[in-house]
């Protein structure tokens, strides 16, 4: 597993470093999760040919993965810090069930999958501290999540490989958009 944020070996080059600010810590946490996703994607791509599948073919899946839209206030035009932060936190909470699904999908990267899941929980906590309007954040229904998880795990092998690939790709894209938006806050 990669080195957790705050223990980055690269930091050695910067002595007398002040403690990380909240924004820097969040930035670093996202980078850490992206590293984990990268490792998981490597295993997925080595195992199947999903990574070569065209975006059009992949778009036909029926997964309801979180995605940034104009109305979420995370883009430059119509940027709204509060609306956007709510979207990021809500999106990450929605991704949690999919990250749970990933837990039994990896052989050599099992530890990495767990690290991505746990690091995302930490990221959510960081962001919740930053949010002023926590009431606007809707937590996914546990019963709905449980039945979704059962449904995903009951798919055939090909669909499970496809689902794994889609989750990793969508999560990476969501984090990249979140990273840019958070730098605007």
């Amino acid at each position: 597993a990669p080195v957790p944020p705050g223990e980055d070996s690269k930091d050695v080059a910067a002595p007398h470093r002040q403690p990380l600010t909240s924004s820097e810590r969040i930035d670093k946490q996202i980078r850490y999760i992206l590293d984990g996703i990268s490792a998981l994607r490597k295993e997925t791509c080595n195992k199947s040919n999903m990574c070569e599948s065209s975006k059009e073919a992949l778009a036909e899946n029926n997964l309801n993965l979180p995605k940034m839209a104009e109305k979420d206030g995370c883009f430059q035009s119509g940027f709204n810090e509060e609306t956007c932060l709510v979207k990021i936190i809500t999106g990450l909470l929605e991704f949690e069930v999919y990250l749970e699904y990933l837990q039994n999908r990896f052989e050599s990267s099992e530890e990495q999958a767990r690290a991505v899941q746990m690091s995302t929980k930490v990221l959510i906590q960081f962001l919740q501290k930053k949010a002023k309007n926590l009431d606007a954040i809707t937590t996914p229904d546990p019963t709905t999540n449980a039945s979704l998880l059962t449904k995903l795990q009951a798919q055939n092998q090909w669909l499970q490989d496809m689902t794994t690939h889609l989750i990793l790709r969508s999560f990476k894209e969501f984090l990249q958009s979140s990273l840019r938006a958070l730098r605007q806050m």
Epitope: A14, I37, K172, Q176, R183
Partner: antibody, heavy 126, light 110 residues
Framework: EVQLVESGPALVKPTQTLTLTCTFS??????????VSWIRQPPGKALEWLAR???????FYTPSLKTRLTISRDTSKNQVVLIMTNMDPVDTATYYC??????????????????WGQGTMVTVSS | EIVLTQSPATLSVSPGERVTLSCRDS???????LAWYQQKSGQAPRLLIY???NRATGIPARFSGGGSGTDFTLTISSLEPEDFAVYYC???????????FGQGTKVEIK
């Protein structure tokens, strides 16, 4: 190999509109985290960032020139275009396009310009 | 508006010497947005350091970056003849991503 090449007129008259094109190869601007910016440098002076366009077509401009600038892209041609209206002699500079730093292994992007074009000199004079 | 101050404006040094360039800003900036560039006469700038202390691809180990808050440094441990150039620091301020560049430090042969 990643490359960026700027093209446009060497000379424009005051009040005219400048159109610059950045043609790139070796990467796709649709890749998550990818971004191309325009930066200029008047002769003997420091660098000045102008505009940026991101992987999902989100656009950013330097506040002082926002009303004069338009950045756009053509992903099929691998090009980014900058339009700057109402040119003035103070806009005489070398104009560069640059790709933002992205760690290709994980898609993490840093706010730094990793790869630059060679630049194109634009003189504003009547 | 945040202003980046680079010092000194010019530095006269001999090859083999250790050089430390300073970049100071009027407000505290994020370490994830501080970068250093090298520009030789008639050429485009080249990224040396990003995120305060990470060396860009292909940059020799003699270049290192550090600092936090309002004070950042670029150190060249032992100056090579090809290192004589102008060095710029840059960072991002609000509204994001407003890139601000310093005025540059010229490193010339003594």
């Amino acid at each position: 190999e990643v490359q960026l090449v700027e093209s446009g007129p060497a000379l424009v008259k005051p009040t005219q509109t400048l159109t610059l094109t950045c043609t790139f190869s070796g990467f796709s601007l649709s890749t998550g985290g990818m971004s191309v910016s325009w930066i200029r440098q008047p002769p003997g002076k420091a660098l000045e960032w102008l505009a940026r366009i991101d992987w999902d077509d989100d656009k950013f401009y330097t506040p002082s020139l926002k009303t004069r600038l338009t950045i756009s892209r053509d992903t099929s041609k691998n090009q980014v275009v900058l339009i700057m209206t109402n040119m003035d002699p103070v806009d005489t500079a070398t104009y560069y396009c640059a790709r933002m730093h992205i760690d290709d292994s994980n898609g993490y992007f840093s706010d730094a310009f990793h790869i630059w074009g060679q630049g194109t000199m634009v003189t504003v004079s009547s | 508006e945040i202003v980046l101050t680079q010092s000194p404006a010019t530095l006269s040094v001999s090859p083999g010497e250790r050089v430390t360039l300073s970049c100071r800003d009027s407000q505290s900036v994020s370490s994830t947005s501080l970068a250093w560039y090298q520009q030789k006469s008639g050429q485009a700038p080249r990224l040396l350091i990003y995120d305060t202390s990470n060396r860009a691809t292909g940059i020799p180990a003699r270049f290192s970056g550090g600092g936090s808050g309002t004070d950042f440094t670029l150190t060249i441990s032992s100056l090579e003849p090809e290192d004589f150039a102008v060095y710029y620091c840059s960072f991002v301020s609000r509204p994001y991503p407003r890139f601000t560049f310093g005025q540059g430090t010229k490193v010339e042969i003594k």
